[in-house]
Interface confidence: low
């Protein structure tokens, strides 16, 4: 039985040329996280495997950085980066959990950063 829930940064916006951190957090389950995939629509951005570590897709290597934690940092944002992003948690024994984030990249400086890094 899948009891876990995924919290995400939700709908966020950022300025063209800036950076943003996408974060998901799996809670309410004791399942072991074996791998997390980050995908943008139908494109694989990155994989974080608990044993093998990170793999960044070659086409994104210059603009995608791993972390913090299981999150993903996108740099040098363009308007084309606007869209849906998915964090896909592969767990044992629960199975797969998926979180969705919608990122809007804005031309102007009026972008509201809905997912800001906070000092803990």
């Amino acid at each position: 039985m899948m009891t876990g829930t995924i919290e995400t940064t939700g709908n966020i916006s950022a300025e063209k040329g800036g950076s943003i951190i996408l974060q998901c957090h799996l809670s309410s389950t004791t399942a072991q996280v074996t791998q997390v995939n980050w995908e943008q629509q139908d494109q694989l951005l990155a994989i974080c495997n608990a044993d093998l570590g990170w793999h960044i897709s070659p086409s994104f290597k210059d603009r995608v950085a791993p972390g913090p934690g299981l999150g993903l940092t996108l740099q040098s944002l363009t308007v084309n980066d606007t869209g849906e992003y998915f964090c896909i948690y592969h767990t044992y024994p629960d199975g797969t959990y998926t979180g969705r984030i919608f990122l809007e990249v804005l031309e102007s400086s009026v972008a509201e950063h809905g997912a800001r890094f906070q000092i803990p």
């Epitope: 957090h25 799996l26 072991q32 996280v33 974080c48 608990a50 570590g53 990170w54 960044i56 791993p66 972390g67 913090p68 934690g69 299981l70 803990p120």
Partner: nanobody
Framework: EVQLVESGGGLVQPGGSLRLSCAAS????????MGWFRQAPGKEREWVAS???????WYADSVKGRFTISADNSKNTAYLQMNSLKPEDTAVYYC????????????WGQGTLVTVSS
């Protein structure tokens, strides 16, 4: 107790250099990911650089070519070599890593202040 301790901050003139260190202690494993972030007065924390255990590195555009991140896996320590420092690099620099093998939680240090001023 699992903790991160940064050191190496201080006052430096524009164009100068500093080397920050981040020591991870209390771990029963070697962190697979370590990174540096910074927070300037009145601004939000921003990512600076990341390094993976395998040696892969990533940098924010604002520091690329001036900063170098590295890690000594045997010591569970990360470093940030900062060259050609500018006044806009003034900030509290924080180190971060993953808390457990599944990298579900983040762990942060207390920060070290870097001031670039003449």
């Amino acid at each position: 107790e699992v903790q991160l301790v940064e050191s190496g901050g201080g006052l430096v003139q524009p164009g100068g250099s500093l080397r920050l260190s981040c020591a991870a202690s209390g771990f029963t494993f070697s962190p697979s990911w370590m990174g540096w972030f910074r927070q300037a007065p009145g601004k939000e924390r921003e990512w600076v650089a990341s390094v993976l255990r395998g040696g892969y590195t990533w940098y924010a555009d604002s520091v690329k070519g001036r900063f170098t991140i590295s890690a000594d896996n045997s010591k569970n320590t990360a470093y940030l070599q900062m060259n050609s420092l500018k006044p806009e690099d003034t900030a509290v620099y924080y180190c971060a890593t993953d808390r457990g093998p599944a990298m579900v939680f983040n762990l942060w240090g207390q920060g070290t202040l870097v001031t670039v001023s003449s």
